[in-house]
Amino acid sequence: LKGQEFAPSHQQVYAPLRADGDKPRAHLTVVRQTPTQHFKNQFPALHWEHELGLAFTKNRMNYTNKFLLIPESGDYFIYSQVTFRGMTSECSEIRQAGRPNKPDSITVVITKVTDSYPEPTQLLMGTKSVCEVGSNWFQPIYLGAMFSLQEGDKLMVNVSDISLVDYTKEDKTFFGAFLL
Amino acid sequence: LKGQEFAPSHQQVYAPLRADGDKPRAHLTVVRQTPTQHFKNQFPALHWEHELGLAFTKNRMNYTNKFLLIPESGDYFIYSQVTFRGMTSECSEIRQAGRPNKPDSITVVITKVTDSYPEPTQLLMGTKSVCEVGSNWFQPIYLGAMFSLQEGDKLMVNVSDISLVDYTKEDKTFFGAFLL
Amino acid sequence: LKGQEFAPSHQQVYAPLRADGDKPRAHLTVVRQTPTQHFKNQFPALHWEHELGLAFTKNRMNYTNKFLLIPESGDYFIYSQVTFRGMTSECSEIRQAGRPNKPDSITVVITKVTDSYPEPTQLLMGTKSVCEVGSNWFQPIYLGAMFSLQEGDKLMVNVSDISLVDYTKEDKTFFGAFLL
């Protein structure tokens, strides 16, 4: 029997079979954020837990300085959830006075950075107006999709307001990617 | 040609190639819930349809008594959506009287249970304050991420209030997992 | 060495090994929608970008006329996010007049069409009441799950109101599927 027999008839020479268990994978979980400088019109990036609790990186997928480093070109499924929480926004105060206004908002962006290209690429965005009425509000934004990434690409999660991120539990705010 | 030729140079002996079609997988869909006893501070678990309509389990992934049973150690992508619906919460009534208050909330938790340890592990949580103004409200909470699971682990979906779960359609409320 | 050596002991004859890189995959992104006729009780389908920017189809997964065509039977993970935005709904105006009412809503449905079967199948639905108070509101609905599909099946994304879909950015509204 030849190894060929298990390969489908359209098997490409350039796409070798490989064990699923050795594919780059990561699931990162929230940690308390330290206030950092960021440009006025640029959303700050979150930093993450990469080795404690439910968090892990494996098979050459590494986390460093807010970035997930892509070790191998291919199609990746990338996902993140950020849970936000805050006090009633000004929106409701203004509204109570009978004046319509542009609502506050919360936004999550998963961004790709390629060293050879100066401008980051926004892969995924979840954005929601927040015009809550109760005195405390909280809600998650979830994102996930498949992208073709190149070896050396870096992924990060940016948010509109780092002070609204719920960092209390590893199951509420997280970020992950795996090679398909 | 030897079987070796399709294995990448970093192929591990302990990670054999395997057909994708024989990996454990399940997609479960909502059924009407029967009221069950649960401890005061413990969210009740949903039970699920596992074989009718869009629901299925395959390749030794089994569903029994509210739990998905993990038949093989590895990295799994786990997901769930729960659609909630309700009448206007007290929150808005109190608000109309001009008194601020802590909003009601809806929560979904995907939980892992390991027989060797009595305490469940919360893998994923989606939680949202609900302070709706219309007389009827409805909304989904979606969760999904990758976790390292062991053979024998059990997965369930817990919710903050089982009576608010929309069980009317299999496409609105569901739960699934598959080995990567 | 025989090719057999990398196949686990439960390898099925009917499930040949195959390279991950040649599996059908697609990620489609939003484009501006052209108003189209649709039946009164049927949600309109979105059309999509399939080759520019972040969008792609590969390995015989094709996009044509609002549909993703499934080229090979198997288990697929299917996902979509639709970001909606609108002006304050009538709901809040009526509410201000003190009359309770059924809230407006936004809905996304991922639908499967099988030529041999007359009735489309709703695979996934995300539906949310909208009773916003600020003058402009926006929010995403995300869906994703695994389904067993047959060669020749067609997938589309339907929405409750095409005029509320945010088509401005490819990272806000998207649709994808990949063979597991």
């Epitope: 837990e49 892990f56 | 390991t114 592990t121 | -």
Partner: antibody, heavy 119, light 106 residues
Amino acid sequence: EVQLQQSGPELVKPGASMKISCKASGYSFTGYTMNWVKQSHGKNLEWIGLINPYSGGTNYNQKFKGKATLTVDKTSSTAYMELLSLTSEDSAVYYCASIYQRHDGIAYWGQGTLVTVSA
Amino acid sequence: QIVLTQSPAIMSASPGEKVTMTCSASSSVNYMHWYQQKSGTSPKRWIYDTSKLASGVPTRFSGSGSGTSYSLTISSMEAEDAATYYCQQWSSSPYTFGGGTKLEIK
């Protein structure tokens, strides 16, 4: 009650290898990450490395790479540290110690295992 | 790696006296913890996350600091506080300990 029960003291010859065990009870073994710490002659504490029983992931202090190998057996809730090619410099008390999240610090410590390397 | 320097290395205090020891980091850290160790026993978590007292730690202990400078304070020294105190950072691997401050009772 949380307990980390380490194996007993060891007298080993230079060049030999040995394995210390640490059996955890009273908490979720896979919920906490196991660390190993060296204390020479009642002096400084040195972090050797960690292993996360949930994921199997390890992180070693560069200084101890090739000297220590960390493993776990989830079925018995036991962590192990193998020390290789021992020299007199490796004579010390070794502690296993578990942490939940990094803002918590090391919550639980074993009683320590005294390793003496001598001909 | 981040080097943690504790000072003083050794100090003594009379019962009722206020005691302060410091831990200086070579780079900024987010997560600083303190452990108490008495002779012949394992270290115990004493103060975590800069300022939180571990279970069973008397309220006369407090912790403070940020960035590269942290301290542990005892408002009123008692005999049972005589021990060695180690700081440890959990911000950057390897997760280093300070050299310890040995606190003796006069």
